[in-house]
Interface confidence: low
Amino acid sequence: TQNKALPENVKYGIVLDAGSSHTSLYIYKWPAEKENDTGVVHQVEECRVAGPGISKFVQKVNAIGIYLTACMERAREVIPRSQHQETPVYLGATAGMRLLRMESEELADRVLDVVERSLSNYPFDFQGARIITGQEEGAYGWITINYLLGKFSQKTRWFSIVPYETNNQETFGALDLGGASTQVTFVPQNQTIESPDNALQFRLYGKDYNVYTHSFLCYGKDQALWQKLAKDIQVASNEILRDPCFHPGYKKVVNVSDLYKTPCTKRFEMTLPFQQFEIQGIGNYQQCHQSILELFNTSYCPYSQCAFNGIFLPPLQGDFGAFSAFYFVMKFLNLTSEKVSQEKVTEMMKKFCAQPWEEIKTSYAGVKEKYLSEYCFSGTYILSLLLQGYHFTADSWEHIHFIGKIQGSDAGWTLGYMLNLTNMIPAEQPLSTPLSHSTYV
């Protein structure tokens, strides 16, 4: 008779990424007998929750339960019922909630209270909802991509082809861009990390890593746009803002009260003689780039070298995975190919931003106008942040790999977060050789 595989002995885990603009639920799966091996956990499902980020629910906390229902029900379907009770669920909220907490601890806690109550109603092993720090967000993103790339393993990987493979075990740096913050994390080469706040020490699979990380709150793409608008409206002579970061012919009315709602624009706040202003796009990449650069204070640095705003940044080292909005925006602009040079990216951005709004709307009829209108800004912002903010150059640009998924798992902090909380990253190399993927009798 033919050999039959024994029933799969697998485990599941759920992580909700409560970002500033939306919430996503990720389901992970791994062979139970290989928990401590590197690279065996993989994503089986991503469910994007319909609606905004949880920080937008301050005025309607009672709607949070319904908001989370569809994705939690999806998790119920995907994970076998027999596994429900032992499947951990974690919710990590990022910069959107950090900003809300800056405005009001009470409001942030109220939102988290309701989130916790809602998630506790499901048959899973709910482990809590919390606002993760920027340092954690950076660190877990770095762990995720290096785990998926097999960088922590001294053994042959169980999967066949690793994308972006280099011949050595040097880890990749991680570049993460969200709506409200951006993180840069990497192992510097023989460089003292001059600022203790930016230093992390890990021992993973028997090897020590001295990691640099920083999270720039308010420098995610959405908050950076609010900052830029708040800065530019200061010098507008009337309620018309001619903006080079939007396509020619684009028009949008912005409420001043919305502009000053976020703590990110506080430094630009002033009494304006109008309640609303109108953005009128003029679509000029170079001027947009110049306007964005004014958000980065590079005149002050208390260390040997800085990124911006006086934040220490060691010399860049090795290859980097750029994910989340770095990837989504560049993918939309068709600029993720390894073959596209930085000069080519700049050239393409100049052309894209100069295209009339009516033409853009026709070319991308299926894309929501709110998102479509902001790709010129977002693409320009990514270039400005990487080149002037983090000091990548035209030649080090080729070391940036825009990554959406690695081996079917999304690049981002959630997998690293779960691996850590479920103790699946051992400090030392596991002694025994793990069993093969499935055992036959």
């Epitope: 601890e105 409001l107 806690d109």
Partner: antibody, heavy 116, light 111 residues
Framework: EVQLQQSGPELVKPGASVRMSCKAS????????MHWVKKNHGKGLEWIGY????????TYNQKFKGKATLTVNTSSKTAYMELRSLTSEDSAVYYC?????????WGQGTLVTVSA | NIVLTQSPASLAVSLGQRATISCRAS??????????MYWFQQKPGQPPKLLIY???TQGSGVPARFSGSGSGTDFSLNIHPMEEDDTAMYFC?????????FGSGTKLEIK
């Protein structure tokens, strides 16, 4: 279980300074701001300010600016408050209390007595 | 600063009866549809204990006989039925804006 353990009573002379501590356990220290409250007989409870353990950022009641300095040591999960240029007006019980919705967790208080 | 005026300054209530303490704010403590008003109980030699948050939500482990109500500028704490263990000082507090402020307190005793 959330616990905030405060340092013992202090008897200090006018003009001197005092530093008290508040050691946290039972929760992730950096997830919550630490607030300080003064309790004296004449004026009831007064909020002094808070510190964000993530970055050491502080927010003070204007009344206590220059009087109180808040600091933290994240590795030992301890918050500190230093009071300077003490006068008899500063004789009181000082509480640390964890931030977030509702000050549900309080230290037992540190009694400061200013006397020549 | 938001000033909280608490009344009465002291109150004596018979066991089993209702005690009502009021707190008036000099300006609204509502934000995003939530009232940032809190009620604390404090006994001699002990730290304050949270009874009510967000004007009407009971704190963890607080007996059902404690209830809070109100919005905007006018709030009240009700204790019914009064028990011997409820003898204490009661404070209202707002955390809508910095500086957070407390009421001057109400001393509750048994008649």
């Amino acid at each position: 279980e959330v616990q905030l353990q405060q340092s013992g009573p202090e008897l200090v002379k006018p003009g001197a300074s005092v530093r008290m501590s508040c050691k946290a356990s039972g929760y992730t220290f950096t997830d919550y701001n630490m607030h300080w409250v003064k309790k004296n007989h004449g004026k009831g409870l007064e909020w002094i300010g808070y510190i964000n353990p993530n970055n050491g950022g502080t927010t003070y009641n204007q009344k206590f600016k220059g009087k109180a300095t808040l600091t933290v040591n994240t590795s030992s999960k301890t918050a500190y408050m230093e009071l300077r240029s003490l006068t008899s007006e500063d004789s009181a019980v000082y509480y640390c209390t964890r931030g977030g919705t509702r000050f549900a967790s309080w230290g037992q208080g540190t009694l400061v007595t200013v006397s020549a | 600063n938001i000033v909280l005026t608490q009344s009465p300054a002291s109150l004596a209530v018979s066991l089993g009866q209702r005690a009502t303490i009021s707190c008036r704010a000099s300006e609204s403590v509502d934000n995003y549809g939530i009232s940032f008003m809190y009620w604390f109980q404090q006994k001699p030699g002990q730290p304050p204990k949270l009874l009510i948050y967000a004007a009407s939500t009971q704190g963890s482990g607080v007996p059902a006989r404690f209830s809070g109500s109100g919005s905007g500028t006018d709030f009240s704490l009700n204790i019914h039925p009064m028990e011997e263990d409820d003898t204490a000082m009661y404070f209202c507090q707002q955390s809508k804006e910095v500086p957070f402020t407390f009421g001057s307190g109400t001393k509750l005793e048994i008649k």
